[in-house]
């Protein structure tokens, strides 16, 4: 054999006895008839030698160390060569060592070509016998980053100040390339960064530096995980120890792109996050240890990357191609913001782009899927605009306000479906006619259905909320003067079953001056509760609202107000109420800012209740609640 090392190679080759075996016959290195058991060849030297036995691989090992000095000159970055070529070396178990020394401010990055690396723990070995041992340096102290086999996920390791990489090849292994390159990076300001890339499903077990010994005091180590957006990652700690901290706290930090609370800070004993979609970083931060009894910080953990479970594997088609002026947003339902990590919950478009919020617009067919352990964490909000620009074309036109079935079939709860109904100013008004008569939600008689309609003005400057209405009441229709939004809001998952009860028709009708008119047809023996719009905030200034209350021929209606006085104090104008019998046109007028409210009154025929507000002083608003009860006429009411 001849080993010739160029002067500029900075390589030293050492052939020495390996682990002693119980072989009877000793073996020697023979150089010009001299028998030796160790041979050192430095760069710029050439040595010719032989072995005194047939199977030197059973006796000797060879170490090839290349020193790379990035302190005094430029660093030879790029693909690292196996030098001398393995074909020129004796067939012994060989270890190639690259020792790179650099300034503290220089970041060094080892880049591993495919196959990437898989970290192994103490006592483990690599199936093919090829191992990569990587060390870093903190001042004069060597820090073991880890031992790795082939066929894993580790693609890059970044360090600073220096790196020592040892590649061990068994004597029979044909490998003739190092499989890695070195690049320079800016300072990473930590011990190291390990990048782990998942192409698909899989798992990786990783360990803190020096494992199973202690992680260096007050150091920081980061793992960067690259995970396809359609897969989910979960972290579990297999083994950890905490040291005795004098200052600071040992912790792990997660950085999740898109998270509002980065970094997410965890104790090592906490349950670690699962179900994360896409890339994330995990950092281990040590503390200042107690000098007398430091203890050790160490961590061994597993990252499991897999396809999401159950619902999340399905693809849902949301066909909005025939819709106009509509947008559907799937988003996280609000929760109290906690510093605790909550696994990611994402919605994906075409199974590719996943995010916590997704808005779908009308005019297209969309394919979506979910990456979420618990779909109740998401909800849907839909907005649709129905507008009339030409009053001659729209008059008497009707539209059905119904949630499309495509949306109802999604596994995410519908929160709000809002219809914005727009009319030309002072030209047209609107009438809402429900499929099933509506009940107004009041404290006295709350809605207990799975959904309600929230009706409010859609004029930006006007703060007018007509109220919340649910099926199963006496309100036959609601007429409104101008632009409104009608929001179907769900309150329970059972809405899916009750969806058939939804149904509201809007028609464009000739313009009228009153803000709103409620047509009420009470049912016998049920008490109908009605209240003025903007309950709790007061009817807006100079607003007029009416209730058209039908009384069947054989019934008597009892109209009851729930307070003695309205409580309104007018700054300008007058607030009044008119109760008018429809048949006789007889009316009673009450000054709401002066008079007491009427005692319960009985009406044998349909009647109007009209309430008009003044400009009240602040804090003295107009809020009225009244009820209508029908009883048969035969009963003696005295």
């Amino acid at each position: 054999f001849e080993i010739a090392l160029p002067r500029e190679s900075n390589i030293t080759v050492l052939i020495k006895l390996g682990t002693p075996t119980l072989l009877a016959k000793p073996c020697y290195i023979v150089i010009s008839k001299r028998h030796i058991t160790m041979l050192s060849i430095k760069s710029g030297e050439r040595i010719v030698f032989t072995f005194s036995c047939q199977s030197p691989e059973n006796h000797f090992v060879i170490e090839i160390q290349k020193n790379i000095d990035c302190m005094s000159g430029p660093c030879p970055f790029g693909e690292v060569q196996l030098q001398p070529s393995t074909s020129l070396l004796p067939t012994l178990n060989r270890t190639f060592i690259w020792d790179v020394k650099a300034h503290k401010s220089i970041g060094l990055e080892l880049q591993f070509s495919i196959p990437r690396l898989r970290q192994i723990g103490p006592g483990e070995s690599c199936p093919d016998g090829v191992t990569h041992s990587i060390s870093g340096r903190i001042d004069a102290t060597v820090v073991r980053i880890g031992t790795f086999c082939s066929n894993g996920t580790v693609s890059r390791i970044k360090m600073q100040e220096g790196v020592k990489m040892a590649l061990h090849l068994p004597w029979f292994h044909p490998r003739n390339v190092s499989g890695f390159s070195i690049a320079n990076r800016s300072s990473i300001k930590r011990l190291c960064i390990i990048e782990s890339v998942f192409e698909g499903e899989g798992s990786a077990t990783l360990m803190s530096a020096n494992y199973p010994e202690g992680f260096p005091e007050d150091e920081l180590m980061t793992w960067q995980f690259v995970v396809p957006a359609h897969l989910r990652a979960s972290v579990s700690f297999l083994n950890f120890n905490l040291s005795n901290c004098e200052r600071k706290e040992e912790r792990v930090e997660y950085y999740i792109p898109g998270s509002t609370t980065n970094p997410e800070v965890f104790k090592l004993e906490d349950k670690q996050p699962g179900n994360m979609a896409g890339n994330f970083n995990l950092s281990l931060q040590g503390c200042d240890q107690d000098a007398q009894s430091p203890g050790i910080l160490r961590l061994q953990f597993q990252v499991l990357v897999q396809h999401p479970q159950n619902e999340s594997n399905k693809i849902y088609v949301v066909d909005l191609s025939n819709e106009r002026a509509m947008s559907l947003t799937i988003e996280p339902r609000p929760v109290k913001q906690s510093r605790k990590f909550v696994p990611g919950c994402f919605v994906c478009l075409e199974s590719r782009t996943c995010s916590s919020n997704l808005t779908l617009t009308s005019g297209s067919k969309h394919k979506i899927s979910f990456l979420c352990d618990d779909l109740t964490r998401l909800w849907m909000n839909v907005e649709k605009t129905i507008s009339c620009t030409d009053h001659r074309y729209c008059q008497r036109k009707s539209y059905s306000l119904q949630v499309p079935s495509d949306i109802l079939h999604l596994p995410v709860e519908l929160h709000d479906f809002s219809w914005k109904l727009l009319v030309p100013k002072d030209r047209l008004s609107l009438v809402l006619v429900p499929a099933q008569k509506l009940q107004q939600h009041t404290h006295e008689k709350p809605c207990n259905t799975s959904f309600s309609y929230l009706v409010a003005s859609a004029i930006p400057s006007q703060d007018l909320y007509f109220g919340s209405f649910c099926p199963g009441g006496s309100i036959k229709q609601i007429q409104v003067k101008q632009n409104i939004s009608v929001t179907l809001r769900t309150f329970a998952p059972s809405f899916q079953q009750e969806a058939s009860r939804q149904g509201l028709t809007v028609s464009f009708i000739p313009y009228f001056k009153e803000e709103g008119v409620f047509t009420v047809t009470p049912d016998t023996k049920s008490k109908v509760y009605l209240r003025t719009p903007n309950w709790d905030r007061g009817l807006p200034s100079l607003t007029s609202v009416s209730w058209n209350i039908s009384v069947p021929r054989d019934q008597v209606a009892c109209l009851t107000f729930f307070k003695e006085r309205s409580g309104v104090v007018c700054q300008t104008g007058r607030a009044f109420m008119i109760i008018q019998e429809q048949r006789t046109r007889a009316e009673e007028i009450f000054s709401l800012d002066e008079d007491v409210l009427p005692k319960p009154s009985f009406h044998h025929h349909s009647f109007w209740v009209n309430i008009s507000n003044c400009s009240p002083t602040s804090g003295k608003q107009l809020d009225l609640l009244f009820s209508v009860t029908l009883t048969p006429r035969t009963v003696d009411l005295t």
Epitope: A4, E8, K42, S43
Partner: antibody, heavy 120, light 112 residues
């Protein structure tokens, strides 16, 4: 006796490649030695350019690294210099030389040199 | 790159005199293997350079013993004990310890 002879065009146009051949007699280029190219500029300044060793290892002057290539043809016992994208600054006398790399460590044997002018 | 500074630039001597040429380096020329690859060459007019001394002080085969090399730290000296007419020409020092290998600027030995 080891003898080296350089050959190649004496005139090269700027931006073109310069190619020189060194024919070695009296010694096999695969037996030993490092086979160098060295040039001498007008004014006598000498510059080591690079070498190819008997076992195919190459080493180049970093100032030329992106432009230089030293190769060999063992069947003809020749080694070659290729210098790309030449400029008038590459006008020089080019020597090929053999050195007992692992012995003297020096450049022991030199060719007589060939003058190359870079001009349009 | 290692810069080798030779002095003097020109050295006029009489035949039979002793001549001394200096070569100075700012950095050590000791290689990690312990060798110092510092050589001396003579280039006679119209000829290629010829090796005289290698590894600081070892004479190349066929070089007369009036040529000697020595060192003091990073200062290297070539001495010719009795100059003969055939010794005239330009003397170059050369280092092969660190890539790029470099030559000194040369010292011209001429007759007074």
């Amino acid at each position: 006796e080891v003898k080296l002879v350089e050959s190649g065009p004496g005139l090269v146009k700027p931006s073109q490649s310069l190619s020189l051949t060194c024919t070695v007699t009296g010694y096999s280029i695969t037996s030993d030695y490092a086979w160098n190219w060295i040039r001498q500029f007008p004014g006598n300044k000498l510059e080591w350019m690079g070498y190819i060793s008997y076992n195919t290892y190459t080493s180049y002057n970093p100032s030329l690294k992106s432009r230089i290539s030293v190769t060999r043809d063992t069947s003809k016992n020749q080694f070659f210099l290729q210098l790309k994208s030449v400029t008038i600054e590459d006008t020089a006398t080019y020597f090929c030389a053999g050195g007992d790399y692992y012995g003297t460590g020096a450049v022991d044997y030199w060719g007589q040199g060939t003058t190359v002018t870079v001009s349009s | 790159e290692i810069v080798l500074t030779q002095s003097p630039l020109s050295l006029p001597v009489s035949l039979g005199d002793q001549a001394s040429i200096s070569c100075r380096s700012r950095q050590t020329l000791v290689h990690t293997n312990g060798n110092t690859y510092l050589d001396w060459y003579l280039q006679k007019p119209g000829q290629s350079p010829k090796l005289l001394i290698y590894k600081v002080s070892i004479r190349f085969s066929g070089v007369p013993d009036r040529f000697s090399g020595s060192r003091s730290g990073t200062d290297f000296t070539l001495k010719i004990s009795r100059v003969e007419a055939e010794d005239l020409g330009i003397y170059y020092c050369f280092q092969g310890s660190h890539v790029p290998w470099t030559f000194g600027g040369g010292t011209k030995l001429e007759i007074k």
